[in-house]
């Protein structure tokens, strides 16, 4: 099944969100991504730990994920490049670039976005914007176009709390509101934005969405500059 | 139409609580947020809070403890209780349809109901 | 907080003229910035939106502009009707913040 759900958000503004990817398996959305260079998309290692066997595309310049759209694009995956240190078992180093079998074709609807290379928690807060192709409800119904959400930037000392996430949000992770408008799994791999700004990536473990003492989590791709740097380069 | 509309009590005692009640027509309440805005006599404009179209709520911290806010989707009206009320608290106060799509703005604003605390 | 800050607080201008009034932002809000208009009867209207887009029914004689910290809403061609004290507010943070207003008056 995919792995994606916003909660609680609206249809988004079709093709108001240009660096946003679709991660698919045998033609079918799976996670999504974020495109950060002409080449590279950004998304969640454990979006591809059961895909072994199938064909891992890239979806560019969509809001229908099924009705056809000028800016549309399929890209197959040249190279796959998990974060080295990743797990199975873990949401810590929950990154993985994708590499395009050609440049992507650059336009209106397709655009990289500006990544955080500045090491630095978003204050408490901070509105940043997540968006996915996942279920928009607990019924599980799929959404076939873009969806949204607006949320507050929740501080690390609340997220760790015993009775929210139990000091497993590490100085890299960070975290965001999830009081019924959330993200989930399937969004996995999809980016959250902050003033413009790719800060995060929402990670795929498995936790209950929507629950406000179950905050969303999000990997920050500040913590990560390094390793992003070395794999596009 | 979209419109809203405050009714409240007028006249509150310090000490006592408040609540308000914002009615709302020409749009679902499970399709957008609702906020809250005061003024105080001759200052500016203060958000208190807003709930969402799914129903979770979000407070300015600097009255979150005194705070609450509910609604009832059905009747499409939209409730704010504050408590322990002291003078400061007089003021003009509006409710707000919030628009929350790509961009955050309040749209359509009620045309506030007087509360004054007095004894 | 975020605290705005709009220094003027009544400006006089004559009916034709271009006005400005200005907000500043105590840290960057990226364009995250909505201005309102309040009548002298307490109405309050939405005029513009993310820094420089015009909410629906809003005449073309009102723009807005900036970036960072600092922004500006501009009425090209002063009218009677736009007597009005005007506040500008944040979004990219909460709690959402007003700038203190600036009230317009015609000479």
């Known amino acids: 099944p995919p792995r994606g759900r916003i909660l609680g958000g609206r249809e988004a503004e079709a093709h108001a969100r240009p660096y946003m990817a679709s991660v698919q398996l045998n033609g079918a959305h799976l996670c999504g991504g974020v495109l950060v260079a002409e080449q590279w998309v950004l998304s969640a290692a454990h979006c591809l730990e059961d895909a072994a066997d199938g064909k891992v595309q890239v979806l560019l310049g969509a809001h229908s994920l099924s009705q056809p759209e000028p800016s549309k694009r399929l890209y197959d995956v040249l190279r796959a490049v998990p974060h080295p240190d990743s797990q199975p078992d873990t949401i810590d180093h929950d990154l993985l670039l994708l590499q395009l079998s050609e440049k992507a074709t650059l336009g209106p609807a397709v655009r990289p976005l500006p990544w955080q290379r500045v090491d630095r928690d978003v204050a408490p807060g901070t509105l940043c914007d997540v968006a996915g192709w996942g279920i928009v409800n607990h019924a599980g119904r799929r959404p076939d176009s873009l969806q949204h959400v607006l949320l507050p930037v929740l501080d690390r000392a609340t997220c760790n709390r015993r009775t929210h996430h139990d000091g497993a949000i590490t100085e890299r992770l960070m975290c965001a509101e999830s009081n019924r408008r959330d993200s989930c799994k399937g969004d996995s791999g999809g980016p959250l934005v902050c003033g413009g700004v790719l800060e995060g990536v929402v990670t795929s473990g498995s936790r209950v969405c929507g629950n406000r003492k179950k905050p969303g989590i999000y990997t920050r791709v500040a913590s990560y500059a390094a390793w992003i740097d070395s794999v596009l380069a | 139409q979209v419109q809203l509309k405050e009714s409240g009590p007028g006249l509150v005692a310090p000490s006592q609580s408040l609540s308000i009640t914002c009615t709302v027509s020409?749009?679902?309440?499970?399709?957008?947020?609702v906020d809250w805005i005061r003024q105080s006599p001759g200052k500016g404009l203060e958000w208190l809070g807003v709930?969402?179209?799914?129903?979770?709520?979000n407070y300015n911290s600097a009255l979150k403890s005194r705070l609450s806010i509910s609604k009832d989707n059905s009747k499409s009206q939209v409730f704010l209780k504050m408590n322990s009320l002291q003078t400061d608290d007089t003021a003009m106060y509006y409710c707000?349809?919030?628009?929350?799509?790509?961009?955050?703005?309040?749209?359509?604003w009620g045309t506030g109901t007087t509360v004054t605390v007095s004894s | 907080d975020i605290q705005m800050t709009q220094t003027t607080s009544s400006l006089s201008a004559s009916l034709g003229d271009r006005v400005t009034i200005s907000c500043r932002a105590s840290?960057?809000?990226?364009?995250?910035l909505n201005w309102y208009q309040q009548k002298p009867d307490g109405t309050v209207k939405l005029l513009i939106y993310?820094?420089?887009r015009l909410h629906s029914g809003v005449p073309s004689r009102f723009s807005g502009s900036g970036s960072g910290t600092d922004y500006s809403l501009t009425i090209s061609n002063l009218e009677p009707e736009d007597i009005a004290t005007y506040y500008c507010?944040?979004?990219?943070?909460?709690?959402?913040?007003f700038g203190s207003g600036t009230k317009l008056e015609i000479k």
């Open positions: 707000a349809r919030s628009y929350d799509g790509s961009y955050w703005y309040f749209d359509v």
């Open positions: 020409g749009f679902s309440l499970t399709s957008y947020g």
């Open positions: 709930i969402w179209g799914v129903g979770s709520t």
């Open positions: 840290q960057v809000i990226s364009n995250y």
């Open positions: 993310y820094t420089s």
């Open positions: 507010q944040q979004y990219s943070k909460l709690p959402y913040t």
